[in-house]
């Protein structure tokens, strides 16, 4: 008996071939001997089966001795043994129809779980293997689960169902909803304008939700909400903003925040959360602000940084085009009685200068 695998919702063509290459009488029946379709001369006739409105054949092939049964919009319950009667012969074809669906929605938040459920006909024992867009393979039976979805899991998942050494392939498009970056750091000199950007890693037709930026300043004992906003069809509207600092927010995506001035009291870490309509859970992006200040008070030249810096970072004070006068892996350095000239305060790591502030020391007369 020939086995054919079909996909729910698809169209399948079951073949039946006569030895004579001409149009002769044929019938297709199901396992209950109920007629599905056949012919009367050059006319297609249909029986009382449940497939009535979804069954068809190809009249153009009859003259060649081919009498296919075409079933459209396949259903799991179409799984059956189909019998083609032609020239006093019976050709049996076993059709097995499978369906593969994602648990709820195909748009899932980063960190959530994806469950794929296989619908299969009674008595079948298929195995399923799915390959994610980033090449991750998962195997299972009736259900497959992937916990902790990552951004790289966005895209087309290809799943192969194996039964009776035959296979059928499903493609499911999954969109992982996340920000492009989990974390970012902005380095600014005191007084500079600060731009925070929160680009999303996905595009959807309509995007609606609400968000908030909580900020933990290094100098503060507790965190506070800096801004709350709504998102409606990709349009951003501010609901509430603190008086200090007075953040400004862009009206369009990507989410964009402007802090008019970088000040030591603002240095710290923030967490932007975005709750999307009809989704449980929130998207998160961490943002960090490091602020540098160089000052001269009487005979003391000081450079300080505030904010979440790596302990490997080096803070240096140097006179332009000269060796560093002082370098420390600390958050403040100073020089007593600095000589006149342009001094540079540098915050650097193993690969680059991250932040630089210049201060002019005038000669003392």
């Amino acid at each position: 008996k020939k086995v054919v695998l079909g996909k729910k919702g698809d169209t399948v063509e079951l073949t039946c071939t006569a030895s004579q290459k001409k149009s002769i009488q044929f019938h297709w029946k199901n396992s209950n001997q109920i007629k599905i379709l056949g012919n009367q001369g050059s006319f297609l006739t249909k029986g009382p089966s449940k497939l009535n409105d979804r069954a068809d054949s190809r009249r153009s092939l009859w003259d060649q001795g081919n009498f296919p049964l075409i079933i459209k919009n396949l259903k799991i319950e179409d799984s059956d043994t189909y019998i083609c009667e032609v020239e006093d012969q019976k050709e049996e074809v076993q059709l097995l129809v499978f369906g593969l669906t994602a648990n709820s929605d195909t748009h899932l938040l980063q960190g959530q779980s994806l469950t794929l459920t296989l619908e299969s006909p009674p008595g079948s024992s298929p195995s399923v293997q799915c390959r994610s867009p980033r090449g991750k393979n998962i195997q299972g039976g009736k259900t497959l689960s992937v916990s902790q979805l990552e951004l790289q899991d966005s895209g087309t998942w290809t799943c192969t169902v194996l039964q009776n050494q035959k296979k059928v392939e499903f493609k499911i498009d999954i969109v992982v909803l996340a920000f492009q970056k989990a974390s970012s750091i902005v380095y600014k000199k005191e007084g500079e304008q600060v731009e925070f950007s929160f680009p999303l890693a996905f595009t959807v037709e309509k995007l609606t939700g609400s968000g908030e930026l909580w900020w933990q300043a290094e100098r503060a004992s507790s965190s506070k909400s800096w801004i709350t906003f709504d998102l409606k069809n990709k349009e951003v509207s501010v609901k509430r903003v603190t008086q200090d600092p007075k953040l400004q927010m862009g009206k369009k995506l990507p989410l964009h925040l402007t802090l008019p001035q970088a000040l030591p009291q603002y240095a710290g870490s923030g967490n932007l959360t975005l709750a999307l309509e009809a989704k449980t859970g929130k998207l998160h992006q961490e943002v960090n602000l490091v602020v540098m200040r160089a000052t001269q008070l009487q005979k003391n030249l000081t450079c300080e940084v505030w904010g979440p810096t790596s302990p490997k970072l080096m803070l240096s004070l140097k006179l332009e085009n000269k060796e560093a006068k002082v370098s420390k892996r600390e958050k403040a350095v100073w020089v007593l009685n600095p000589e006149a000239g342009m001094w540079q305060c540098l915050l650097s790591d193993s690969g680059q200068v991250l932040l630089e502030s210049n201060i002019k020391v005038l000669p003392t007369w």
């Epitope: 989990a182 974390s183 970012s184 750091i185 380095y187 960090n288 490091v290 810096t309 790596s310 302990p311 490997k312 970072l313 080096m314 240096s316 560093a324 370098s327 915050l347 650097s348 790591d349 193993s350 690969g351 680059q352 991250l354």
Partner: antibody, heavy 122, light 107 residues
Framework: QVQLVESGGGVVQPGRALRLSCAAS????????MHWVRQAPGKGLEWVAI????????YYADSVKGRFTISRDNSKNTLYLQMNSLRAEDTAVYYC???????????????WGKGTTVTVSS | DIQMTQSPSSLSASVGDRVTITCRAS??????LGWYQQKPGKAPKLLIY???NLQSGVPSRFSGSGSGTDFTLTISSLQPEDFATYYC?????????FGQGTKLEIK
């Protein structure tokens, strides 16, 4: 392509000195911190030293502090490790590696040389 | 200096198994941890940096998690080419320190 090639290894007596070199190609050498990492026969990896992109800062493992000196010549795209007062326990394969530093937040050694073998034996 | 304790020191597993290796720091290193794979006679290869970031070209069956003092490397479904020695490295502060390694062998 991006490549690091170590040289200068060999057999040396305890108390003597040796200088290892690491020739870099395929990238802007002067924009990266560089490391030396070693591995004694049959043992695990041991971090030895780092030098910053401009040579301004150098840090060492306690086991080599005061005996080894890391240096670089950015005009020659070359990293060095001067090893003085060598001991039997310095016997190892010495690897040089490039450090990527992003945003002062993400750090990793993404490119490694194949290693050069140093044997300290009398 | 920061000490890194890796466990287990050796591990036997089969192709297709899910494997977890842990690394513990003697003090808070935030997320300053990387994972490296080494095969006999070869240089180490970077797998994961800054706790959970997959290095370009590394198969997605490798993943990292943790923060503070406790970190994990997970291989979701072992492949024949994954049998090697794995090291964690704290790059949070100088001097950098490696864990003692975990040798992953075929069962």
């Amino acid at each position: 392509q991006v490549q690091l090639v170590e040289s200068g290894g060999g057999v040396v007596q305890p108390g003597r000195a040796l200088r290892l070199s690491c020739a870099a190609s395929g990238f802007t050498f002067s924009s990266y911190g560089m490391h030396w990492v070693r591995q004694a026969p049959g043992k695990g990896l041991e971090w030895v030293a780092i030098i910053w992109y401009d040579g301004s800062n150098k840090y060492y493992a306690d086991s080599v502090k005061g005996r080894f000196t890391i240096s670089r010549d950015n005009s020659k795209n070359t990293l060095y490790l001067q090893m003085n007062s060598l001991r039997a326990e310095d016997t190892a394969v010495y690897y040089c590696a490039r450090e990527v530093a992003l945003e002062g937040y993400y750090y990793y050694m993404d490119v490694w040389g194949k290693g050069t073998t140093v044997t300290v034996s009398s | 200096d920061i000490q890194m304790t890796q466990s287990p020191s050796s591990l036997s597993a089969s192709v297709g198994d899910r494997v977890t290796i842990t690394c513990r720091a003697s003090q808070d290193i935030r997320n300053g941890l990387g994972w490296y794979q080494q095969k006999p006679g070869k240089a180490p290869k970077l797998l994961i940096y800054t706790t959970s970031n997959l290095q370009s070209g590394v198969p997605s069956r490798f993943s990292g998690s943790g923060s503070g003092t406790d970190f994990t490397l997970t291989i979701s479904s072992l492949q024949p080419e994954d049998f090697a020695t794995y090291y964690c490295l704290q790059d949070y502060n100088y001097p950098y320190t490696f864990g003692q390694g975990t040798k992953l062998e075929i069962k």
